[in-house]
């Protein structure tokens, strides 16, 4: 799988977390820090 | 599935203020940055500003800074677009349209009218 | 903020025709370029993202290639229903659409 850095406008995307572009999906992810989870690494569940 | 549906038409007199609101379904707009743009009749494409919803962070064109607010409200899953000063050249199609996880998905647009 | 120069603002070309249509960016935008297909009195239609990658559905005679500053969308043999207008969109920082280009048939 091809990733890359998201774009500079995506920098305050991810809250608890890195964002990373999967470039072969099309699609900005968020990899959350440990403790947290949700499409924007928002929650934290610990 | 996904949509982005708009407010209708308006038309305004100069000076006056226009809202434009933009309601999704089938997905969360906290998951989401809502960005408008707009096209006058005849013309090109143009980036006026983006909402982030989580974090209620708005970033907005030069130009339209101070004329216009973008908010969103997240119990409603709506966002709006409102201008202030309304002039002739104001008269464009207003479009919504989600960025975040995927790449951008428009709404069906919202022409607003400034005559006198 | 980034400005876009997209160029040229119209072509007229055959069917069949190559045809190529170029923006530059006023900085670095990692790739970040979007191109939309417009026709009259319908919202834009996204064709690439990413510099080069096609949506689903899109005809592969389009096509996207560039990096650093400068760009270029290529149909590789023009349609009847390729009329239309095309822009531009950097998403790098903000966003920023070129000035458009209008594609006419010869």
């Known amino acids: 799988v091809s990733i890359t850095k998201c774009n500079s406008d995506m920098n305050g995307y991810c809250l608890h977390g890195q964002c990373i572009y999967l470039v072969d999906m099309s699609q900005n992810y968020c990899r959350c820090e440990v403790g947290y989870t949700g499409v924007r690494c928002e929650h934290f569940y610990l | 599935q996904d949509q982005l549906v708009q407010s209708g038409a308006e038309v305004k007199k100069p000076g006056a203020s226009v809202k434009v609101s933009c309601k999704a379904s089938g997905f969360n707009i906290k998951d989401t940055y809502i960005q408008w743009v707009r096209q006058a009749p005849g013309q090109g494409l143009e980036w006026m500003g983006r909402i982030d919803p989580l974090r209620r962070q708005t970033k907005y064109k030069e130009k339209f800074e101070g004329r216009v607010t973008i908010t969103a409200d997240t119990s409603t899953n709506t966002a709006y677009m409102e201008l202030s000063s309304l002039r002739s050249e104001d008269t464009a199609v207003y479009y919504c349209?989600?960025?975040?996880?995927?790449?951008?998905?428009w709404g069906q647009g919202t022409l607003v009218t400034v005559s006198s | 903020d980034i400005q876009m120069t997209q160029s040229p603002s119209s072509l007229s070309a055959s069917v069949g025709d190559r045809v190529t249509i170029t923006c530059k960016a006023s900085q670095d935008i990692h790739k970040y370029i979007a191109w939309y297909q417009q026709k009259p009195g319908q919202a834009p239609r996204l064709l690439i993202q990413y510099t080069s990658t096609l949506q689903p559905g899109v005809p592969s005679r389009f096509s996207g290639s560039g990096s650093g500053t400068d760009y270029t969308f290529t149909i590789s043999s023009l349609q009847p229903e390729d009329i239309a207008t095309y822009y531009c969109l950097q998403y790098d920082n903000l966003r920023t659409f070129g000035g458009g280009t209008k594609v006419e048939i010869k």
């Open positions: 349209v989600r960025s975040g996880r995927e790449f951008d998905f």
